[in-house]
């Protein structure tokens, strides 16, 4: 039975130019992290391989930064990369847990127009 | 299309150490691993370790720590697997295979021909 | 170490049969298993992954199921050309180990 949850970064907003850490954190189980895979709609992003390591898809190389931990890091954002994310934990022997985030990329006087009325 | 091609046949004495090679071609080479497979003569398949090509981590079987060694050159899209200290029991055909680890299911897709290594005083 | 135990170890059945071939893992591995077929004199190949995704070009009448420790891989209807050895393979994590194989021959 698949007891675990997933915790993410939920929605999410940055500047046009910037740089965002996409998080997910595995909970509530003991099942064995093999392999921690991240996608953009369809697009593989990268990998983390519990044996090999980081592995980065050759079209984002220059754009996206292993880590921190099993998050990824996603940098020159363009409004483009606005949309959903996935992390997908390959585990045993629960099989498969999948977490989602919203990343909404905004023009820079945007962003800071609207940090203005962010509530702490 | 996606080729491995080996080295080929070797015959060393107990003791002595053995290098097989595996040229990849048909696919970006570092966006892979690739894995080492044996059989000696009537038996089974034998996992022996695998190594990423994109960061030249390993991971070898428990039974070969110390006496394996894999390494990639990217330059040349090729796999290398040496044994060291060889006994009689360590005659078996050879494989490399491509690792497709993208999915998270680490299967082995593609196969090399096979390098058959008899150890023999 | 997960151990993978394969039954039986050898068969024989007609052309047209339907064959079953069994692997078992000592630890739930959801279905992070793959079949391989190695043909007499041949190189591996490999015939399903995730337990039970054909693997491209792959003849349908190949099939696996199964998840947790159970695991099962049937030809629906045995061909000459299906005569060779199966493997399964647990391929969540190292050690990737196969099982110990099970012969296929036709009666």
């Known amino acids: 039975m698949m007891t675990g949850t997933i915790e993410t970064t939920g929605n999410i907003s940055a500047e046009k130019g910037g740089s965002i850490i996409l998080q997910c954190h595995l909970s509530s189980t003991t099942a064995q992290v093999t392999q921690v895979n991240w996608e953009q709609q369809d697009q593989l992003l990268a990998i983390c391989n519990a044996d090999l390591g980081w592995h980065i898809s050759p079209s984002f190389k220059d754009r996206v930064a292993p880590g921190p931990g099993l998050g990824l890091t996603l940098q020159s954002l363009t409004v483009n990369d606005t949309g959903e994310y996935f992390c997908i934990y390959h585990t045993y022997p629960d099989g498969t847990y999948t977490g989602r985030i919203f990343l909404e990329v905004l023009e820079s006087s945007v962003a800071e127009h609207g940090a203005r009325f962010q509530i702490p | 299309q996606v080729q491995l091609v080996q080295s080929g046949t070797e015959v060393k004495k107990p003791g002595a150490s053995v290098k097989v090679s595996c040229k990849a071609s048909g696919y970006t080479f570092s966006s892979y691993a690739i894995t080492w497979v044996r059989q000696a003569p009537g038996q089974g398949l034998e996992w022996m370790g695998w190594i990423s090509a994109y960061n030249g981590n390993t991971n070898y079987a428990q039974k070969l720590q110390g006496r394996v060694t894999m390494t990639t050159d990217t330059s040349t899209s090729t796999a290398y697997m040496e044994l060291r200290s060889l006994r009689s029991d360590d005659t078996a055909v050879y494989y490399c295979?491509?690792?497709?680890?993208?999915?998270?299911?680490?299967?082995?897709?593609?196969w090399g021909q096979g390098t058959l290594v008899t150890v023999s005083s | 170490d997960i151990q993978m135990t394969q039954s039986p170890s050898s068969l024989s059945a007609s052309v047209g049969d339907r064959v079953t071939i069994t692997c078992r893992a000592s630890?739930?591995?959801?279905?992070?298993l793959a079949w391989y077929q190695q043909k007499p004199g041949k190189v591996p190949k490999v015939l399903i992954y995730?337990?039970?995704t054909l693997q491209s070009g792959v003849p349908s009448r190949f099939s696996g199921s199964g998840s947790g420790t159970d695991f099962t891989l049937t030809i629906s209807s045995l061909q000459p050309e299906d005569v060779a050895t199966y493997y399964c393979q647990k391929s969540n994590s190292a050690p990737l180990t196969f099982g110990g194989g099970t012969k296929v021959e036709i009666k």
């Open positions: 295979a491509r690792v497709d680890f993208w999915s998270g299911y680490n299967y082995f897709d593609y």
């Open positions: 630890q739930g591995i959801s279905n992070y």
């Open positions: 995730a337990a039970s």
